[in-house]
């Protein structure tokens, strides 16, 4: 009896959908695996007789509930199928946006770049797919614990009237208000403000 794959899960970030599993202990030899997806009542092979423990399902429609399954094989024997269901538009993880930060005196000027949909040629982004897409920004003085959050209305934001000659850190994430779903935070970017440009009277 061939044991089934273990810890079967979908690792999906920005619609790059990788089905992953672990090979079970099996004394007779090395196992291979076949992974399939349900396409209009018929299961279609995606990865056949692979020695890998993952399979790329990124071509599946972003919109729809998909049934995927994987089994282990050895010679003419095979395990039972392990099934999972997956809806990319609901389940994919929203990766961190890009961010450009520029210091102008006592202000930080930020521009945000929505994460790209993985593995497509064109520059479609997660913002294209989700109508309610917005950004959350959090910033703080470097070395302090107190963080401030803002929700920019556009793909850019300016933090004004900051303390001069002070290092501020900023990070951004995508947020979908209609789904109450937050993406991953970008790595913090820390920049030092310069002088206050106001001229004394």
């Amino acid at each position: 009896m061939v044991p089934p794959p273990e810890n079967v899960r979908m690792n999906s970030v920005n619609f790059k959908n990788i089905l992953q599993w672990e090979s079970p202990a099996f004394a007779k030899g090395n196992l291979t695996f076949t992974a399939q997806y349900l396409s209009y009542r018929i299961f279609q092979d995606k990865c056949m007789n692979t020695t890998l423990t993952e399979c790329d399902f990124s071509s599946l429609s972003k919109y729809g509930d998909h049934t995927l399954r994987v089994r282990a094989e050895f010679a003419d024997e095979h395990s039972d199928w392990v099934n999972i269901t997956f809806c990319p538009v609901d389940d994919t993880i929203i990766g961190p946006p890009g961010m450009q930060v520029e210091v102008l005196a006592d202000s930080l000027h930020m521009r945000f770049l929505a994460p790209k949909i993985e593995n497509e040629y064109e520059t479609w982004t997660m913002k294209n797919v989700y109508n309610s897409w917005t950004y959350n920004v959090q910033y703080w003085k470097n070395g302090t614990d107190e963080k401030f959050q803002i929700t920019p209305q556009y793909d850019f934001e300016v933090l004004r009237n900051l303390e001069p000659w002070t290092t501020y850190c900023v990070q951004v994430r995508g947020f979908l208000p209609d789904r109450n779903k937050a993406g991953e935070w970008s790595e913090p970017v820390c920049e030092q403000t310069t002088h206050d440009e106001t001229v004394p009277s």
Epitope: S39, S59, K62, Y63, H66, E120, Y121, E122, N128, V129
Partner: nanobody, 126 residues
């Protein structure tokens, strides 16, 4: 929400021609990958032809040289020109779309398209 509406089906003699249309609304049309599928009675739905947002096309072996897929971005319409029709082409023909898609995956399978029309019937008699 993407909406697709097929038209142009009908009855024709073997060797004849038909042109199917699929009017799309609800998304930036140029971002679609689109396809034509068909389903004969008692059979599974199968891919006929597909076109990516960059204009590259693919065909099922059974229709190569006879069918041509095209799209008019200005009219938000997908077409399937079917020539030299055969009785085995008889089926319900469906238009399908996957928004925000390019040529990266060469989509041809039902599960790779998220939005579907209601279908138009094509009947080819001998």
């Amino acid at each position: 929400q993407v909406q697709l509406q097929e038209s142009g089906g009908g009855s024709v003699q073997a060797g004849g021609s038909l042109r199917l249309s699929c009017a799309a609304s609800g998304y930036t049309y140029s971002s679609y990958c689109m396809g034509w599928f068909r389903q004969a009675p008692g059979k599974e739905r199968e891919g006929v032809a597909a076109i990516d947002s960059d204009g590259s096309t693919r065909y099922a072996d059974s229709v190569k040289g006879r069918f041509t897929i095209s799209k008019d971005n200005a009219k938000n319409t997908l077409y399937l020109q079917m020539n030299s029709l055969k009785p085995e082409d008889t089926a319900m023909y469906y238009c399908a779309a996957e928004p925000y898609c390019s040529g990266g995956y060469k989509r041809t399978m039902v599960a790779e398209f998220g939005y579907w029309g209601q279908g138009t019937q094509v009947t080819v008699s001998s």
